[in-house]
């Protein structure tokens, strides 16, 4: 699987879409998981409704929601109030028994103005007062990467 990059602005909502063959995955529940390390397990974040026929109903775990268009073959994950710690590698999965097929590998990038993450006293240029928080949904930007093209950031 190639990795698809989805970019969302910090504080906004990011929609990740995972297309799949609706016939091949007929009757299967879906899940969104976070990859823990390059070779580590994929930790389940949220999965679709226990009853496959109700997969269109939005299920939520914290700030992450999932819904499945089983006829159209599109799994949609929404990350609300995107934060820097949301950045990283994820997978969309199709579940069958205790097994899981990968539908798409995803890299979430959280966008912010580079000055946002300096302490107020760290701005070399005079700081302006922060403005209102708006809540519109960020229409995600996505692009494909070759497998392994972006390494995991080093841990400190």
């Amino acid at each position: 699987h190639n990795t698809t990059v989805f970019q969302g602005v910090e504080g906004q909502s990011l929609q990740v879409s995972c297309p799949y063959d609706s016939m091949k995955h007929w009757g299967r529940r879906k899940a969104w998981c976070r990859q823990l390390g390059e070779k580590g397990p994929c930790q389940r974040v949220v999965s679709t409704h226990n009853l496959w026929l109700l997969s269109f109903l939005r299920r939520r775990n914290g700030s992450t929601a999932i819904t499945d268009d089983t006829l159209g073959g599109t799994l949609t994950i929404t990350l609300r109030n995107l934060q820097p710690h949301d950045a990283g590698f994820y997978q969309c999965q199709s579940l069958h028994g205790s097994e899981a097929d990968t539908l798409r590998k995803v890299l979430v990038e959280v966008l912010a103005d580079p000055l946002d993450h300096r302490d107020a006293g760290d701005l070399w240029v005079p700081g302006e007062s922060e403005s209102f928080e708006d809540a519109h949904v960020e229409h995600s930007i996505s692009r494909s990467l070759l497998e392994g093209e972006i390494p995991f950031p080093p841990t400190s």
Partner: antibody
């Protein structure tokens, strides 16, 4: 006084490697996202790499033109950033600047030629 | 990639007269904090770029107040109220929100 001083540029053959350094002082380096930007002779500015702070797990980002060949890193204890450049191509010939976006170094020249 | 388009690419100016440079981005640069991540730089001949305006309209430290920045989420303008001889060089707009970060092609300002 804020200072950013690049070094490590020079002449290298295609396929070769170079490591650029950027020593900084005069600002709280560890909190600042740092970048490398290059400029070919007579051309415009091209952003090529970016490294975030420790609080962001030193996340790195690259322009497609250098991805897989260049590696940005930082040493907060030395307030220095680096750019390891491998598999160099003639089109990598440029002046390389390090920057925190508000202040810039004077640049170091990299020439890739046989 | 976000495309930054500047106009004009060359701008002959008369000292003491106003001057204006436009920059358009192919997508909005407005963040959730109401900040617009648009920056303006001046690169004087033989020098490194220097920051003039950050976040669309904020004057960087040490920059004369004859410079000002304005705009919306996608259309931006750098204005010089009264051009001085030291203002010659290449002006670049840049977006630092979406990866990869991108610069405009540059506008060369020279004295008539």
């Amino acid at each position: 006084e804020v200072q950013l001083v690049e070094s490590g540029g020079g002449l290298v053959q295609p396929g070769g490697s170079l490591k650029l350094s950027c020593a900084t002082s005069g600002f709280p380096f560890s909190n600042v996202w740092m970048h490398w930007v290059r400029q070919a002779s007579g051309k415009g500015l091209e952003w090529i790499a970016h490294i975030k702070a420790k609080s962001d797990n030193y996340a790195t980002y690259y322009a497609e033109s250098v991805k897989g060949r260049f590696t940005i890193s930082r040493d907060d204890s030395k307030t220095t950033i680096y750019l390891q450049m491998n598999s160099l191509k003639t089109e990598d010939t440029a002046v390389y600047y390090c920057t925190g976006l508000d202040y810039w170094g004077q640049g170091t020249t990299v020439t890739v030629s046989s | 990639d976000v495309v930054m388009t500047q106009s004009p690419l060359s701008l002959p100016v008369t000292p003491g007269e106003p001057a204006s440079i436009s920059c358009r981005s192919s997508r909005s640069l407005l963040t959730s904090k109401g900040i617009t991540s648009l920056y303006w730089y001046l690169q004087k001949p033989g020098q490194s770029p220097q920051l003039l305006i950050y976040r669309m309209s904020n004057l960087a430290s040490g920059v004369p107040d004859r410079f000002s920045g304005s705009g919306s989420g996608t259309d931006f303008t750098l204005k010089i109220s009264r051009v001085e001889a030291e203002d010659v060089g290449v002006y670049y707009c840049a977006q630092f929100l979406v990866y990869p970060y991108t610069f405009g092609q540059g506008t060369k300002v020279e004295i008539k």
